[in-house]
Each structure stands twice: as C-alpha cells, then as structure tokens.
C-alpha cells in the first residue's frame, strides 16, 4: 500500500520528476518566445519595459553555482504564480489592439496553470514545504492607457522569458547534482 | 547583419591567465545567451558555459569551473571569457557563440580565437 | 555527461549523391516530442554553422537539401544531392541535459 493519502510521496526518482518539470518550462519558453515576437511584430516597442508588480529577476551573477532545490523551486513557483496573475489581468484589462492576441494569451496562461501544478505536484514528491508568497499579491490596477497596456504585455513576456530561461538552467543544473 | 566579433590571437605562458571578447551587434543582446566552445586540435568541440546577458548570471561545464569567467558588458553588447591557470591543454581555437535561451542551440558563431599556450 | 558517437568518421562522396550521417546517443535525448540534437557544419578555418536544430528544425537560410530525423538515441543528417560546398566536416550535439555535448564529427570528402 502506498503512503496514506495527503502524506508527501517522495519520489524514487527525483531526476525524471525535474525532466519533466523542464520539459514542461521549455515549452512554455518556446510559446513566450513566439508570442513576444509576434508582439514586437504588431506593436513595436523601443527599449525595456518595466512593470513595477512584476517580480525581480531571480538569478544574478554568481548566484546559480549556489542554488539548491528547494529555493529554485519555491523561487519559481512564486514567481510563476505572479506572472500568471499578470497574463490573468492582460487578458481582462486588454484592450481593443491586444484583444487580437487573446487566443495565444489564454493558451500560455493555460500552460502557465499547468506548469504551475506540475511544479507543486514536485515539492510535494520531494517533501519540501509548499510556500506562500512573501507578501500578500497587490491588486493590479487598470492599464492608464491602450499604449500602457502594451506595454505592459511587452514587460510580461520579457520577464517571463528571462524567467523561464533562469528556471531551465537552474533546474538541468540543479539534475547534474542529484 | 548578425554578427559576433572576437579579439585576436593570443601567446601565454603556463600559468598566466587570458581574457577573450566578443562584441555583438544586429541583434538585441539580452535576447539570447551568450555560450563559449572551446576547440583544440584533433579534440571534439567542447561547451566551456554560457551567461545570460540580461542579468549576467553564469553557468560553467563542471570541469571549466574554477578556472573560467564568463562576464558581460551589457552597455556595449560584449560578452568576455577569461581563463585561469593556463596549460598546455588549454591550447585550442576559443568560439562565443549565441544560444537560444533554455535550449543550448548555437545559431550564430564569431569568428574564433585562437590561444596558444607554450613555454 | 551523454556521449555522442558520429559515424561514419569519413565519408566519399560524389556531387549529386546523398550523404548520410549517423549520430548516436549514450542515453535517449528525446523527450514528449522534443529531442535536444542539433547538426553543425564547419569548414576548415571557419566557425561551425548551425544546420538543424531540435533534430529536424532548418535553420534560417539553410538550403532545404539538408534534413534530419530520429528520436531517442539515433539520429540522422540526410544531405541531397550533394553540392561541391558540401564537403566539410559535420557535428551532432545534444541538448538534452547540462552540459551540452558534441560528437566527435563526420567528415564528409569529395570522390
């Protein structure tokens, strides 16, 4: 019989749980990557775009060597959640010019979503303690303008580009150690 | 045009050190990582690391840890490789070359530098 | 760290043939419909040129001549026909797991 139910499984094998946690993150890195550029395409944008409730990147020079899973993962984990949260409010705060974007949006939202549970789903195969965000998610305001929602969705999927790109490296380095 | 530029050919001794550059230009810098292979005579290619030039975070092929740094000038889209200790082993033909991010496929290369170490 | 053995090691071939270049994996480098290898081309004094990448993906600008397939373990660089800017030496490298790696090269000559 297996453990008892809502008691963590640790994994036999914590390796194919990370593979599959990656696999995951490069696929969504791949759909960002595509619909940033097809956001360069329809409204180009000079520049970094900065939103203030994003997260701050998470690695810096240096740090990665130091990494150990469980701050990855609960590093990762919050960070996705407010990118979700933030490709959530594009989606409903958008307007007329990004509505023709909808339909990706909602797919990597979906993905994000899925992404999200498989990462949860590896914290709890690992026993490690599922933590909540720092502080309490501050409510995202209406976009000053259509410009200001673009934005904004350009600030989005750069960040979650960068993000999901620290998250690979971070995780495949984090296998070799296992 | 894309293009990663590469500094020239350098002569060491065994034991001194070698920093290399690699200025970028006809694309936007932060976009992609920044991989080093290294290529010496009747050796295959082998992948040194590669940093992400947006924040300038490092990651190094275990056994090139210790001896390479990778850095970034992000001001003037350069990426710089410098390696320590440096022995004969080391004398081989050094690529930046620029990686698509979470992926390790390398679609743009320089032109090489080759280092040559002999006492 | 995956092993990549290319073979052959040299191949002789005419202008107008098709080459084929094997590339074999020490462990599977696929996974849910992505496999992580990628095929160079290099030519003496040159840098490596990006061919293919995620087993079967042109490149931009690279003739469609060139093709790659396999999964798992086993792939393959299909060249036809051949043409006289060909002949260079051909790497296969996985992405699969850190660190990235490449195959010892094939290098395909002229008859």
């Known amino acids: 019989p297996g453990p008892p139910a809502g008691s963590p499984r640790v994994s036999s094998d914590p390796r194919a749980d990370l593979d599959s946690a990656v696999l995951l993150t490069r696929s969504l890195l791949a759909d960002t990557r595509q619909l940033a550029a097809q956001m360069r395409d329809k409204f180009p944008a000079d520049g970094d775009h900065n939103l203030d409730s994003l997260p701050t990147l998470a690695m810096s020079a240096g740090t990665l060597g130091s990494l150990q899973l469980p701050g990855v993962l609960t590093r990762l984990r919050v960070d996705l959640m407010s990118y979700f949260r933030h490709v959530q409010w594009l989606r409903r705060a958008a307007g007329p010019s990004l509505k023709t974007l909808e339909p990706e949006l909602g797919a990597l939202q979906a993905r994000l979503e899925r992404l999200l549970r498989r990462l949860q789903l590896l914290m709890s195969r690992l026993a490690l303690p599922q933590a909540a965000p720092d502080q309490p998610a501050v409510p995202l305001g209406p976009p000053a303008s259509a410009w200001g929602s673009i934005r904004a969705a350009h600030a989005i999927l750069g960040g979650l580009h960068l993000t999901l790109d620290w998250a690979v490296r971070g995780l495949l380095l984090l296998k070799t150690r296992l | 045009e894309v293009q990663l530029v590469q500094s020239g050919a350098e002569v060491k001794k065994p034991g001194a050190s070698v920093k290399i550059s690699c200025k970028a230009s006809?694309?936007?810098?932060?976009?992609?990582?920044m991989d080093w292979v290294k290529q010496a005579p009747g050796q295959r290619l082998e992948w040194i690391g590669d940093?992400?030039?947006?924040?300038?975070?490092?990651i190094y092929n275990q056994k090139f840890t210790g001896r390479a740094t990778l850095t970034v000038d992000k001001s003037a889209s350069t990426a710089y490789m410098e390696l320590s200790s440096l022995r004969s082993e080391d004398t081989a033909v050094y690529y930046c070359?620029?990686?698509?991010?979470?992926?390790?496929?390398?679609?743009?290369w320089g032109q090489g530098t080759t280092v040559t170490v002999s006492s | 760290d995956i092993v990549l053995t290319q073979s052959p090691a040299s191949l002789a071939l005419s202008p107008g043939e098709r080459a084929t270049l094997s590339c074999r994996a020490s462990?599977?480098?696929?996974?849910?419909?992505?496999?992580?290898i990628h095929w160079y081309q290099q030519k003496p004094g040159q840098p490596p040129r990006l061919l293919i990448y995620?087993?079967?993906n042109l490149d931009s600008g690279v003739p469609a001549r060139f093709s790659g397939s396999g999964s798992g373990t086993d792939f393959t660089l299909n060249i036809h026909p051949l043409e006289e800017e060909d002949f260079a030496t051909y790497y296969c490298?996985?992405?699969?797991?850190?660190?990235?790696?490449f195959g010892q090269g094939t290098k395909l000559e002229i008859k």
């Open positions: 940093i992400n030039p947006h924040n300038g975070g490092p």
């Open positions: 006809g694309y936007t810098f932060t976009d992609y990582n």
């Open positions: 462990k599977s480098v696929s996974t849910s419909g992505y496999s992580y």
């Open positions: 070359a620029r990686g698509e991010l979470g992926h390790w496929y390398f679609d743009v």
């Open positions: 490298q996985h992405s699969r797991d850190l660190p990235p790696t």
């Open positions: 995620l087993a079967s």
